[in-house]
């Protein structure tokens, strides 16, 4: 008789999830020699321990503490790049500008990027059929709690000038309900962070509007200013040229506005 299984509204655990996490950990520690002390089997055990046999709507930050402790890492606090709804360009940027870091450039972020996972209460099984959706089912699900936890800690670590890349093609360039808007903005530490600099990335080739005047950017500026952090904003009119100029800053075409 097949056992009854809870049906959730979201997609199930990414296939080959254990193998993927383990392989990513091994790859990361090979690429980053300063993390070679990490025991990837212990990392997987700690990751698994955060959600296996637990109700997938009842996950807490504490569940991820053992994993976070194994993933402890030095991050230059003045080289942090946050992003919202424009992950690919942010990652392309840090792949070129190697001294800057998104959360996904850290071990913890790298392990979980683009993956889904959940378990079931009182069984050691991983649920590959469905996992809770943040809106339709519950917010304290394994994936949401993980990203809320590591995003909060990443924002807390930031200092000096913090950069954030925002998607100028979206109706809400700054979205209060995004991870950036709901978690990271509120966990920047005013005693350490001097300025938040937003880079608004334009989508259309002929789009010459000043998106730094967008009402949602003004809302972001207001939130940040109330937290005693300075705010600045730049339009990136040509993201392709922007990346090219990061790669080759001495190129003569890179002195003009991008």
């Amino acid at each position: 008789v097949p056992r009854w299984r809870q049906q959730w509204s979201g997609p199930g655990t990414t296939k080959r999830f254990p193998e993927t996490v383990l392989a990513r950990c091994v790859k990361y520690t090979e690429i980053h020699p300063e993390m070679r002390h990490v025991d990837c089997q212990s990392v997987w055990d700690a990751f698994k321990g955060a959600f296996i046999s637990k109700h997938p709507c009842n996950i807490t930050e504490e569940d991820y503490q053992p994993l976070m402790k194994l993933g402890t890492q030095t991050v230059p606090c003045n080289k942090i790049l946050l992003w919202s709804r424009i992950k690919d360009l942010a990652h392309q940027f840090t792949q070129v500008q190697r001294d800057m870091f998104t959360l996904e450039d850290t071990l913890l972020g790298y392990l979980a990027d683009d993956l889904t996972w959940c378990g079931e209460f009182n069984t050691s099984k991983i649920n590959y059929q469905s996992c809770p959706d943040w809106r339709k089912d519950c917010s304290n699900n394994p994936v949401s709690v993980f990203w809320k936890t590591v995003s909060r800690r990443f924002a807390e670590a930031a200092c000096d000038v913090v950069h954030v890349m925002l998607n100028g093609s979206r109706s809400k360039i700054f979205d209060k309900n995004s991870t950036f808007g709901s978690v990271e903005v509120h966990n920047l530490q005013p005693e350490k962070v001097q300025t938040l600099e937003a880079w608004v990335i334009h989508g259309g080739r002929e789009d010459s509007r000043d998106l730094c005047q967008d009402p949602t950017i003004k809302e972001l500026e207001s939130i940040i200013s109330k937290r005693n952090i300075q705010f600045s904003c730049k339009n990136i009119y040509r993201p392709d040229k922007f990346l090219q100029c990061v790669k080759n800053p001495e190129d003569s075409s890179c002195t003009s506005e991008i």
């Epitope: 002390h37 402790k69 194994l70 590591v150 807390e156 670590a157």
Partner: nanobody, 125 residues
Framework: QVQLVESGGGSVQAGGSLRLSCAAS????????MAWFRQAPGKEREVVAT????????HYADSVKGRFTISRDNAENTVYLQMNNLKPEDTAMYYC??????????????????WGQGTLVTVSS
Amino acid sequence: QVQLVESGGGSVQAGGSLRLSCAASGYTDSDYIMAWFRQAPGKEREVVATIYIGGTYIHYADSVKGRFTISRDNAENTVYLQMNNLKPEDTAMYYCAATKWRPFISTRAAEYNYWGQGTLVTVSS
């Protein structure tokens, strides 16, 4: 209240070795990051090496990689800095520092809440 007491500093010829000790007291768990910083006259305090008391995390400044080794003895509540192949530019006051664990560690002195009084290391050529 965490107290830190350094020892082991002194004068040594270039190429020589020293072992610094940092005895810690006053903390109730192993949830601390411990670090060795140094400050040469007229320069900013800079991190040399960092270790997590409750785990495997270790980090070194590029300038000391392969020459310095940080280690801990949890039973003795002591953190060590073994310094080999010392150079004149390693001359500085060496400080032990501690802060509560966090997953993303900064290399900045301002992040550390607890400090020892320092021990002087002088390397002559």
